[in-house]
């Protein structure tokens, strides 16, 4: 018994397309072996029509393709412009046609609906443009040209060469008469509506010698592409409507009851509140195509989505559209992670970001979602050692705890840090999560002095006061740099006196820098962690100056400056241009992301805003 499986019977009509999926066990050998589609002959042979190695029979030229999806263990044969001659018995299979790893498929193509003789069939998508060509003879060259539509038993005039236009077609139809050399006139109808479908008759002349040509216009409502994504994952809708609408406002909407389609996002700046923080509409290409990324998929996001083009930025009759049916799989591989993390002004947050554990070597990124215009997400930090200049000293991306999770720590929080942030990688585009940082009332738990000045050649001791709530946590000091925060030795100096109502379990832990050098200048963090899970941090900037008087410096909280709201960094810090995630295909299509800092970064991230879990900033 062959392990290949597919549809036993496929039925269609002339002029239509079919898409035949064949399933195979996705073993390593099967994934890479030849895939084929062949037609069975009367004597038992099977003639290859198309294969995964590039062969296409002349019978299929320009109307068929075969696509292998090795990760799913499937391959798909698409055949367009079907005729009754395509009816017959076929095999889809792996390897060599005669070897038996195949599945029998019966394709039956029946005649389409009855048409008048000499009828030209035009099949056009909703919202697009059709050109109906009407030949005539020399004797009718100077006579009236007209197009009628058959409504029931009666032909109704649509347009004619004397300037008449039927009100149903106003503003979207024209009649062109070709130059004297060509005996042809054409009628162009754009923004096609479903109601435009039907039988048409073109006519040149009005007497018994007139030339007539029948046309059958079929207007296709786009069949929705089925998209099946995981809860908490992300989806990208790629919308290619054609260059003719390149300068028209674009939209993505979700169909609600009946024919209503509620705008999710459009290029006129509208965005549905339910998608705040988790949607990007990527700038359109010159050909008018664009894409929309939605992250943090929720159960209620399932449904039918349409993208289209219309000056109003919403669905109207005659809008060219593309359709998707989104199904959200609740058996998600993407773990739950907090959707809201809270921190206090001056304090810190530690955000856990999930990623596909099979892609531990992927580059990790963190970006700040901005709602202006169509949404963008400028990168703030990556795992390759880049940090946006304004975040130097207060932002770090750590590979810990690993195995499917990385950590982002942001300290010296201000109210301006409130907002939505996306975790993403240059690997699996479905693994993107969004977290909202909220700044709440309160005091930071860790107490450190403000900026500190050390003297060259002397010893500096910097205190960090930990309240008793962190008694069971590991306490550490580290020196911040672009790639993380390198741990430094520290001394436990016993209980702290910095906290009221705090017992012996509070702690004062000091960082000591002996024989200070210029290299010691920079940002230092004290913090708490449990194993590989990080909690709160506090930052101190240590400046180094020339010796003025001998001795060592012991900095206390009282002597320290107040922690600055904004840091003005040494002019030597390299300013790196603003990088924004704008093109989600960048990662999807495996374009080189060797140094994303030098390009407008694409990425695809996911949010779990469907869950109401919240994570405090001070502890895990």
């Amino acid at each position: 018994k062959s392990p290949i499986f597919g549809p036993e019977e496929v039925n269609s009509v002339e002029g239509n397309s079919v898409s035949i999926t064949c399933y195979y066990p996705p073993t390593s050998v099967n994934r890479h072996t030849r895939k084929y589609w062949c037609r069975q002959g009367a004597r038992g042979g099977c003639i290859t029509l198309i294969s995964s190695e590039g062969y296409v029979s002349s019978k299929y030229a320009g109307r068929a393709n075969l696509t292998n999806f090795p990760e799913n263990g499937t391959f798909v044969v698409n055949i367009a412009q079907l005729s009754q001659d395509d009816s017959g018995r076929y095999k889809c299979g792996l390897g060599i046609n005669s070897r038996g790893l195949s599945f029998d498929v019966s394709l039956e193509v029946s005649q389409g609906p009855g048409l008048l003789n000499d009828t030209k069939v035009y099949t056009v998508d909703l919202g697009r443009t059709v050109t109906i060509n009407c030949p005539f003879k020399t004797e009718n060259a100077q006579k009236r040209k007209s197009l009628y539509k058959q409504i029931g038993l009666y032909p109704v005039l649509v347009i004619d060469s004397s300037g008449y236009v039927n009100p149903n077609y106003t503003g979207r139809i024209r009649l062109d008469i070709q130059g004297t050399g060509q005996l042809l006139f054409s009628v162009v109808i754009n923004q096609l509506r479903l109601s435009d479908a039907g039988q048409y008759l073109c006519q040149a002349g009005d007497d018994s010698n007139s030339n007539k040509k029948n046309a059958d216009l079929q207007v296709l409502k786009p069949e929705p592409e089925l998209v099946y994504e995981d809860l908490r994952g992300s989806v990208t809708f790629h919308c290619a409507l054609g260059p003719e609408v390149a300068n028209v406002a674009k939209f993505l909407c979700r169909q609600s009851s009946g024919e209503n389609c509620d705008v999710v996002v459009n290029t006129l700046g509208k965005r549905a509140p339910a998608f705040e923080g988790r949607i990007l509409l990527n700038p359109q290409d010159k050909d008018g195509s664009f894409s929309v990324v939605i992250t943090g998929l929720r159960k209620e996001d399932a449904g039918r989505y349409l993208c289209g083009a219309h000056s109003d930025g919403q669905l109207q009759e005659g809008s060219p559209i593309q359709a998707w049916q989104l199904f959200v799989n609740e058996e998600s591989t993407i773990p739950r992670s907090p959707t809201v993390v809270k921190g206090v002004a001056g304090g810190s947050v530690a955000v856990l970001c999930p990623y596909n554990r099979k892609e531990s070597k992927s580059i990790k990124y963190w970006c700040l979602w901005e709602g202006a215009q169509n949404g963008r997400c400028p990168l703030l930090v990556d795992s390759e050692g880049w940090v946006k200049a304004q975040y130097e000293g207060r932002l770090s991306l750590l590979e810990e705890p690993g195995n499917g999770t990385f950590t982002v720590i942001l300290n010296q929080l201000t109210s301006r840090d409130a907002g939505f942030y996306w975790c993403l990688t240059n690997g699996d585009t479905l693994w993107r999560t969004t977290v909202e940082i909220k700044i709440i009332e309160g005091e930071p738990n860790l107490k450190v002095p403000g900026n500190v000045t050390a003297v060259l050649g002397e010893t500096l001791k910097v205190p960090c006061h930990f309240p008793c709530k962190f008694s069971s946590y590991e306490k550490y000091w580290c020196k911040w740099n672009n790639t993380g925060c390198q741990a430094l030795p520290s001394q436990d100096e016993g209980p702290s006196k910095a906290f009221v109502n705090c017992d012996e379990n509070s702690r004062l832990v000091s960082l000591t820098l002996n024989l200070v050098t210029r290299a010691d200048e920079g940002w230092y963090w004290c913090g708490v962690k449990q194993g590989h899970f990080y909690g709160e941090t506090a930052a101190v900037y240590v400046a180094v100056e020339e010796r003025k008087a001998a001795g060592s410096r012991d900095v206390s909280l009282a002597k320290a400056d107040a922690a600055p709201d904004e840091k003005v960094l040494d002019s030597g810090f390299r300013e790196i241009e603003n990088k924004a995630i704008q093109d989600p295909r960048l990662f999807a299509e495996e374009k080189a992301v060797a140094d994303t800092r030098d390009q407008a970064d694409g990425s695809r991230a996911s949010v779990d805003s469907g869950s109401s879990e919240e994570q405090g900033g001070s502890s895990r």
């Epitope: 019977e9 009509v13 079919v18 799913n72």
Partner: nanobody
Framework: QVQLVESGGGWVQTGGSLRLSCAAS????????MGWFRQTPGKEREFVAA??????????YYTDSAKGRFTISRDNAKNTVYLQMNSLKPEDTAVYYC?????????????????WGQGTQVTVSS
């Protein structure tokens, strides 16, 4: 969700025929696989046949034991799927279930728990 109601089961002798119906309500099932499965006591549900359609193209899938004997079909206007079972054998005795799921992936698997009918008993006696 799609609500599914099966009917048409019953008792028949070996070699006889039955026609099962599955009426779907709640939403149109044009973007779904509609499948027939069967289950005998103490065994897992097994795939029998499935149908899907896109526009005016229809795709029919059968398990090996159903090929040549069973025919799956649909009536769009009634939002109903049928399983015509001919040349029935005692081993076809089972509870037959109708199921629906999004038209993605292998039609033999991944049907959600809440998209099943209540089942109809088919008994074939020798």
């Amino acid at each position: 969700q799609v609500q599914l109601v099966e009917s048409g089961g019953g008792w028949v002798q070996t070699g006889g025929s039955l026609r099962l119906s599955c009426a779907a309500s709640g939403r149109t099932v044009s973007s779904y696989y509609m499948g027939w499965f069967r289950q005998t006591p103490g065994k897992e549900r097994e795939f029998v046949a499935a149908i899907s359609w896109v526009g005016s193209s229809t795709y029919k899938y059968y398990t090996d034991s159903a090929k040549g004997r069973f025919t799956i079909s649909r009536d769009n206007a009634k939002n109903t799927v049928y399983l015509q079972m001919n040349s029935l054998k005692p081993e076809d005795t089972a509870v037959y279930y109708c199921a629906a799921r999004p038209r993605v992936g292998d039609p033999r698997s991944r049907y959600d728990d809440d998209n099943w009918g209540q089942g109809t008993q088919v008994t074939v006696s020798s």
